[in-house]
């Protein structure tokens, strides 16, 4: 049904889904905080730009009675009663920011005669790419995906001389939200990783992992994982490591290995980990949150959520275009906005850019160092150190398929 | 360890000047947006002003607006807020907080406008 949008008049309405099912196991109250301060600051940049006019955010809660199991798998109906709430209430915003599972916000975009922008921290997955009124303001699974396959293919690089095109993906089932679309990308056969790799195979037990750490008749020497250090220990334990085994750690919302007092344990020696750069510091530089930094990342998106409309609403109103139209929910893509830590770059689909950096711990001094950066914006890799202290031989990393020879 | 230290409270005249400071620890200062808050007594906290990690945007709340300014020094990791033409509803306790989430705190000091 056609539902009203407070969206008028000098009066700009948010609303904010807060669903009890959730990419991240979020305190909502912490999320409340960062929708007021992104209010907070948003007031402030419209009454600097000479725009007098209101803006509030409306919290939806799910009464929670059903779908209770806190993680996204009972969520999909979750974001469909909440949508049923406001409309049965009359009450919709400019904006719908909310959703972070892939199931609810892909079922919420199919069923819905989407005219307003709809702003997702998460929504990781392949089947909420390309959606035209979407937002997605944490890296979803397709950034990864083309992290990987540039990085499998480069072989230009003085510690990467080899192209790859096998891998192992471990994937057990008990990942976190993001790793399990992340993972889930890479082994759809139709994805594009799939398609840029002659073999790949997925692991989903613990001994099969652990039996191709010494397999001398693996097929690969690279093995795709998620989640951070402690998982991989949990997993690998101290158990012996052949040399030319690489294991790709993908841990993106995690920048405890940028601390200055963190020492990287032995058990991540062969070890390359993926992760985002931490905001508006420099790399290498010493901070301290008491929020786990996944948490921080998740609210944070929330946070920059509201800013992102702020800019936009900024631009609409100063160009006196209309909010409720079709323009205002198509225009939530192709641009950079002032976020809390800095510019967000969104891309032509409205998901989020960032720079990537790949890490490796030095042999000499037991610290993640940065071997390269990725930018997902323009599909490039940057190398940083040209000569890195790796475990591997010649300090270099080893060609994916042994006994392969320079190719 | 993160800590926030505050200072430059005490008795004002309806009308004058105070300066309060706050100092940072324990932590990239220059990473974070900071906030002043207060809480007047038997009231709820209210924030005051908040600004950028890099200085380039500050904010007010509308209560003291063109008589207050907020400021950083991130080479001294240091936080102020300059209270002038004081009233007597800005008797409070003012805290610096760091982040959006207000994650940390300092002691407070308290700050008495009155005749």
């Known amino acids: 049904s056609q539902v009203s949008q407070n969206c008028h008049n000098g009066s700009y309405e948010i609303s904010v889904l807060m669903m009890g099912n959730s990419a991240f196991a979020e305190p909502l109250k912490n999320l409340e905080d960062a929708v007021n301060e992104g209010l907070e600051i948003v007031r402030g940049r419209l009454q600097n730009a000479g725009l007098n006019v209101t803006v509030n955010a409306t919290f939806m809660y799910s009464d929670g009675l059903i779908h209770n199991s806190g993680d996204c798998r009972s969520s999909t109906c979750e974001g469909l009663d909440l949508l049923r709430k406001i409309s049965n209430a009359q009450r919709m915003g400019c904006v719908l920011i909310g959703p972070s599972c892939t199931y609810s916000t892909f079922q919420m975009y199919l069923d819905t005669e989407l005219s307003y922008p709809m702003i997702s921290a998460g929504s990781f997955g392949l089947s909420c790419d390309y959606k035209e009124t979407l937002t997605r303001l944490m890296s979803p699974a397709r950034k990864l995906m083309y992290f990987l396959v540039n990085f499998w293919k480069t072989n230009d690089l003085p510690f990467k001389t080899y192209s790859w095109s096998t891998s192992y993906v471990y994937k057990n089932g008990t990942e976190t939200e993001d790793c399990f679309w992340y993972l889930n990308a890479l082994e759809a056969s139709v994805s594009y990783f799939s398609h840029e790799l002659g073999f790949k195979v997925v692991l989903r037990q613990d001994k099969e992992f652990q039996d191709i750490l010494m397999d001398h008749n693996r097929k690969s020497n690279v093995i795709i994982m998620c989640g951070g250090p402690e998982f991989l220990y949990k997993l690998k334990g101290d158990r012996a490591v052949a040399e030319d085994i690489v294991i790709i750690l993908v841990d993106l919302f995690n920048d405890q290995y940028f601390e200055d007092n963190v020492t990287a344990p032995d058990y991540m020696k062969n070890v390359l980990v993926l992760t985002l750069s931490p905001g508006n510091s420099l790399l290498n530089s010493s901070f301290s949150r008491n929020l786990s930094p996944t948490k921080r990342d998740f609210a944070l998106a929330y946070l920059n959520g509201i800013l992102l409309f702020g800019h936009m609403l900024k631009i609409f109103l100063e160009n006196g275009e209309n909010i409720t139209t079709p323009k205002f929910a198509h225009a939530f893509r192709n641009l950079t906005f002032e976020g809390y830590d800095g510019p967000v770059t969104l891309d032509d689909w409205g998901d989020v850019d960032s720079t990537m950096v790949l890490l490796y711990t030095s042999v000499d001094t037991k610290k993640y160092k940065v071997l390269l950066t990725y930018d997902t914006h323009v599909n490039k890799t940057y190398p940083v150190d040209m000569s890195p202290t790796f475990t591997w031989k010649n300090s270099k990393l080893p060609n994916d398929i042994t006994g392969r020879g320079p190719q | 360890e993160v800590q926030l230290v505050e200072s430059g409270g005490g008795l004002a005249q309806p009308g004058g000047s105070l300066r309060l400071s706050c100092a940072a620890s324990?932590?990239?200062?220059?990473?974070?947006?900071m906030t002043w808050v207060r809480q007047a007594p038997g009231g709820r906290l209210e924030w005051v002003a908040k600004?950028?990690?890099?200085?380039?945007?500050?904010y007010y709340a509308d209560s003291v607006k063109g008589r207050f300014t907020i400021s950083r020094d991130n080479a001294k990791n240091s936080l102020y807020l300059q209270m002038d033409s004081l009233r007597a509803e800005d008797t409070a306790v003012y805290y610096c907080?760091?982040?959006?989430?207000?994650?940390?705190w300092g002691q407070g000091t308290l700050v008495t406008v009155s005749s």
């Open positions: 907080t760091r982040d959006y989430n207000k994650d940390y």
């Open positions: 324990g932590f990239t200062f220059s990473r974070y947006w």
């Open positions: 600004i950028k990690y890099d200085g380039s945007e500050k």
